[in-house]
């Protein structure tokens, strides 16, 4: 096989190599049915692999390593990331603003009304930010024909059974153009179980309208599926920019707040929480976290929900208790204990169970000291010290942050400890504070933790 693997030859099975080759042929410069697109340097397997690694923000090695294979094995949309379906003619966008859709058949996993509601809501995502209108037809030919099918279902792009490829849609154009197909070997739901039909449909309809995949992990048009929570869906800014570049803005956007993916080198970047996790550093911002390995400069960006689906989208504070292999995550008046990917039974708990007074609405930052077994909890302009060993709040607390750590300001957004120094984050600034000399030794931009 023409795919070089990283490291030892016995790293990857023959099955993995064949899977990776199929993946790259499907999603990176797929050849057309007649095989007219001959393999050339640009579409060789190594080149495709490099493109795929670049697309997902992985280290571009041109070698198949476990990080790359992990990404390949995640559930995703069947539309190519680079290159396009070559069987059917396409246009850049629809030349009209009034489009029709028809639900040709239904999945047995949901009621008809649930399916109809999911599709209606998915179209509304796009009509809310553009002049587009969508009308449902009950028979005949619509611009966007929606159907559920399994394996080979009539378009030469077969589905693959449970998980893997979830759905695909064709770009604007005649015949198959605009049509959206959903793999009925998946379990479709209107919740976080199985695959959420609304979320997948909203993504696929983006393709039906002419959008390609986005490299932004926070975008709806990112190719990999992540359930983003029960609360009101807000179309990310990246998708709004994309669709409005094709169709322009609508008259009135009912949800004018469109979440942006944080830029790690933005000089005004402030952070929500920082914790170590089994030797790595997790840096939380909005719905995301950066995962920084000690030997790497490039941090990987993830949606928090892709790691921990049961957690809220945004968190306030976090700390690790390494000897127990646990991390604690705070949001509002609740906190969670996590072992790796798993939430411990009995959580979330109320922060008042730690001995905090009822008027404390949230913890803004937290840091644990393994040598003493103590954890500092920051809220507003105050700090508490919790004894993790005896599960009791220390006497003489709370104290004023300004008194215990003079010079760092009267609030803490995020904090972590390393080699006898505490790093306090306050807005776009971080303070390196020496535990031994009890003073600030350096002031740096917050994003220097991300090698900016």
């Amino acid at each position: 096989l023409p795919l070089p693997s990283g490291g030892d030859e016995d790293d990857l099975s023959e099955e993995d190599l064949q899977f990776a080759e199929r993946y790259l042929r499907s999603y990176y410069h797929p050849t057309n049915l007649a095989g007219i697109l001959k393999e050339n340097a640009a579409s060789s397997m190594t080149e495709r692999l490099r493109e795929m690694q670049s697309f997902f923000g992985l280290e571009v090695t041109g070698k198949l390593d476990d990080n790359t294979l992990d990404v390949m094995k995640k559930p995703r949309c069947g539309v190519p990331d680079v290159g396009e379906y070559n069987v059917f003619p396409r246009t850049l966008k629809w030349s009209k603003m009034n489009l029709t859709y028809r639900i040709v058949n239904y999945t047995p996993d949901m009621t008809h009304s649930e399916v109809e509601k999911a599709f209606k809501k998915a179209f509304k995502v796009w009509s809310d930010v553009t002049p587009l209108n969508f009308t449902r037809l009950h028979d005949g030919i619509a611009d966007i024909m929606i159907s559920f099918g399994i394996k080979e279902h009539g378009d030469f792009y077969p589905f693959d059974g449970p998980s893997g490829l979830l759905a695909h849609a064709f770009p604007p154009g005649p015949n198959y153009g605009g049509d959206a197909h959903f793999d009925d070997d998946e379990t479709w739901t209107s919740s976080s179980k199985g695959y959420n039909l609304f979320l997948v449909a909203a993504h696929e309809f983006g393709h039906s309208l002419g959008l390609d995949h986005s490299k932004d992990p926070g975008a709806l048009m990112f190719p990999i599926y992540t359930y983003t929570g029960k609360s009101h869906f807000m179309l990310p800014d990246d998708d709004v920019q994309g669709i409005q570049s094709l169709y322009g803005p609508g008259d009135e956007d009912p949800n004018p707040k469109h979440p942006k993916t944080p830029d790690k080198c933005d000089p005004s970047l402030s952070l929500d929480a920082i914790t170590s996790l089994r030797g790595e550093t997790m840096i939380f911002k909005d719905r995301f976290f950066w995962r920084l390995h000690p030997q790497q400069v490039d941090a990987e960006l993830f949606l928090t929900k892709s790691f921990w689906p049961e957690l809220p989208n945004r968190i306030d504070a976090a700390y690790e208790h390494p000897s127990h292999d646990l991390i604690f995550i705070f949001r509002g008046r609740k906190f969670w204990a996590l072992n790796g990917y798993d939430i411990l039974e009995g959580y979330p708990k109320k922060i008042s169970e730690l001995g905090l007074p009822k008027e404390v609405k949230k913890i803004s930052a937290a840091v644990h000291f393994e040598d003493t077994g103590k954890t500092l909890l920051f809220s507003g302009n105050q700090v508490w010290r919790y004894d993790d060993t005896n599960h009791i709040m220390d006497k003489d607390y709370p104290r004023l942050i300004e008194e215990d750590f003079p010079g760092i300001g009267d609030k803490v957004d995020a904090v972590y400890e390393k080699n006898g120094y505490i790093y306090f984050f306050n807005g776009p600034i971080q303070f390196e504070y020496s535990i031994w000399s009890n003073r600030i030794v350096r002031v740096m931009p917050a994003n220097s933790i991300l090698w900016c």
Partner: nanobody, 114 residues
């Protein structure tokens, strides 16, 4: 509740490779994260590698780049491919599904000699 059985342990020279398997029976394996822990003589049990239901992997810093965790949900099996083994990797390796409060296997011994 998932029942787990590890296999694939044994003795190997430093620099060699082993592939551990973890066969799951009982309830649906795909619903649980899958982790490997290890315990060396007179030491605390430590996390080695984990893979979530969404196939996101996580490694202890000491094994990253040498060990690869994977899972086959259809077969109900988890794997740990261990390359470039070192004497300090000697330990009993335990398979886990669902985290500390989840299910554990009985372990398989890995001995790496110099």
């Amino acid at each position: 509740e998932v029942q787990l059985v590890e296999s694939g342990g044994g003795s190997v020279q430093a620099g060699g490779s082993l592939r551990l398997s973890c066969a799951a029976s009982g309830s649906t394996f795909s619903r649980y994260s899958m982790n490997w822990y290890r315990q060396a003589p007179r030491k605390q049990r430590e996390f080695v590698a984990g893979i979530s239901t969404a196939r996101i992997t996580h490694y202890a810093v000491s094994v990253k780049g040498r060990f690869t965790i994977s899972r086959d949900n259809a077969e109900g099996t988890g794997y740990l491919q261990m390359n470039s083994l070192k004497p300090e990797d000697t330990a009993v390796y335990y398979c886990n599904a669902g985290g500390l409060q989840g299910s554990w296997g009985l372990g398989t011994l890995v001995t790496v000699s110099s």
